[in-house]
């Protein structure tokens, strides 16, 4: 029961986590313009992995996708890749874990197969969570680095002048969503791995019965072996006769030359 609960909870936690990773990846608020020095600005900018948005104080918002792949920083591309890998691994993990759930019966799937699938999905969730956490952390590091490297330069163009404004960007909501989602996916994966141990079929431990011949005139009663097979009326391995047939639990520790195992 505990195994099923652990597996089920792991699945649900991972599902929430992966939904969060997808949400974070699609969100536009990865970096938001820092308004510390200019709190009354009419327009501010926030940017995601895929597009840039501007928002007015009135609430009017406009977003545009980045034009090119080549003009974007390598770090941004790396973050995109990490998040996509996280989503793909998580989605495959979810698919595998659905079939691995103990509460779902699919044909005559053995427990060993379910255990293997649970472990596989668990590992996938762990890697997925790590990818998301890594992606968000790389992006956060990029923001922090850029924040403290504020420089502005000017150059003259055709007829006029273009000034590069070093706008400081700070952590957006997507970063926190990504960190939490990655953590949940990771926790879900660990729970699935723990559940896998409980699902693995253990060796059946039948109680061995040893017979102690106390003398040469021992009369073995018919049906004595019913104790070991577990099919007779005597399924609890109780002593059937006084001749010395005992369950392994009852065997005395001192050796005897008449012991037969």
């Amino acid at each position: 029961m505990a195994v099923t609960a652990c597996q089920g909870l792991g699945f649900v936690v991972s599902l929430i986590g992966i939904a969060g990773i997808i949400a974070a990846t699609c969100m536009d608020q990865w970096s938001t313009q820092d308004l510390y020095n200019n709190p009354v600005t009419a327009v501010f900018n926030y940017q995601g992995l895929w597009r840039s948005c501007v928002r007015e104080s009135s609430g009017f918002t406009e977003c545009r996708g980045y034009f090119t792949l080549l003009g974007l920083p390598a770090m941004l591309q790396a973050v995109r890749a990490l998040m996509i890998v996280g989503i793909v691994l998580g989605a495959i993990g979810l698919l595998v874990s659905i079939f691995a759930l103990k509460c779902i019966r699919i044909g005559s799937m053995e427990d060993s197969a379910k255990a293997n699938m649970t472990l596989t999905s668990g590992i996938m969730f762990i890697v997925s969570g790590l990818c998301a956490i890594a992606g968000v952390s790389v992006f956060a590091n990029m923001l922090v680095t850029n924040f403290w490297m504020s420089t502005a330069n000017m150059y003259t163009g055709m007829g006029g002048m273009v000034q590069t404004v070093q706008t400081r960007y700070t952590f957006g909501a997507a970063l926190f969503v990504g960190w939490v989602a990655g953590g949940l996916t990771l926790i879900g994966g660990v729970m699935m791995c723990i559940a896998c141990r409980g699902l693995a079929p253990e060796e059946t431990n039948y109680k061995a019965v040893s017979y102690h011949a106390s003398g040469h005139s021992v009369a073995y009663k018919p049906g004595g072996f019913k104790a070991s097979t577990g099919f007779g009326s005597n399924t609890k391995n109780k002593k059937i006769y006084d001749g010395g047939a005992r369950t392994e639990d009852e065997v005395q520790s001192y050796p005897s030359k008449h012991d037969y195992v």
């Epitope: 900018n45 840039s52 104080s57 590069t164």
Partner: nanobody
Framework: EVQLVGSGGGLVQPGGSLRLSCAAS????????TGWYRQAPGKQRDLVAT???????NYADSVKGRFTISRDKSKNTAYLQMDNLKPEDTAVYFC??????????????WDAGTQVTVSS
């Protein structure tokens, strides 16, 4: 690169009208605000009017009710309609655009300036 081309300046009599235009070109992702500053001889550059991407406008007190700023979003062009011009409006009018050109790449572009002279 981002380029701004301003036009429409010239000589006009007091009480007359002029229309300045400012066209932005290049790899512009988001055009945040566009507007004009003016600089009279021997004076500092002052804000005339601005318009945001959403159409919110802002005017200097000295031009309120006489000047109107507008924009054509599809052409990335802003217009400054100047009515009831006064001699004190004589200056070089500089068009500017605050733009996002890429990932965490914000720039302010200026044109070379357009001379507006109000004289009888």
């Amino acid at each position: 690169e981002v380029q701004l081309v301003g036009s429409g300046g010239g000589l006009v009599q007091p009480g007359g009208s002029l229309r300045l235009s400012c066209a932005a070109s290049g790899s512009i992702l988001n055009l945040m605000t566009t507007g004009w500053y003016r600089q009279a001889p021997g004076k500092q550059r002052d804000l005339v009017a601005t318009i945001t991407f959403g159409g919110t406008t802002n005017y200097a007190d000295s031009v309120k009710g006489r000047f109107t700023i507008s924009r054509d979003k599809s052409k990335n062009t802003a217009y400054l309609q100047m009515d009831n011009l006064k001699p004190e409006d004589t200056a070089v009018y500089f068009c500017y655009a605050d733009v996002i050109v890429g990932f965490q790449d914000r720039r302010v572009a200026w044109d070379a300036g357009t001379q507006v002279t109000v004289s009888s």
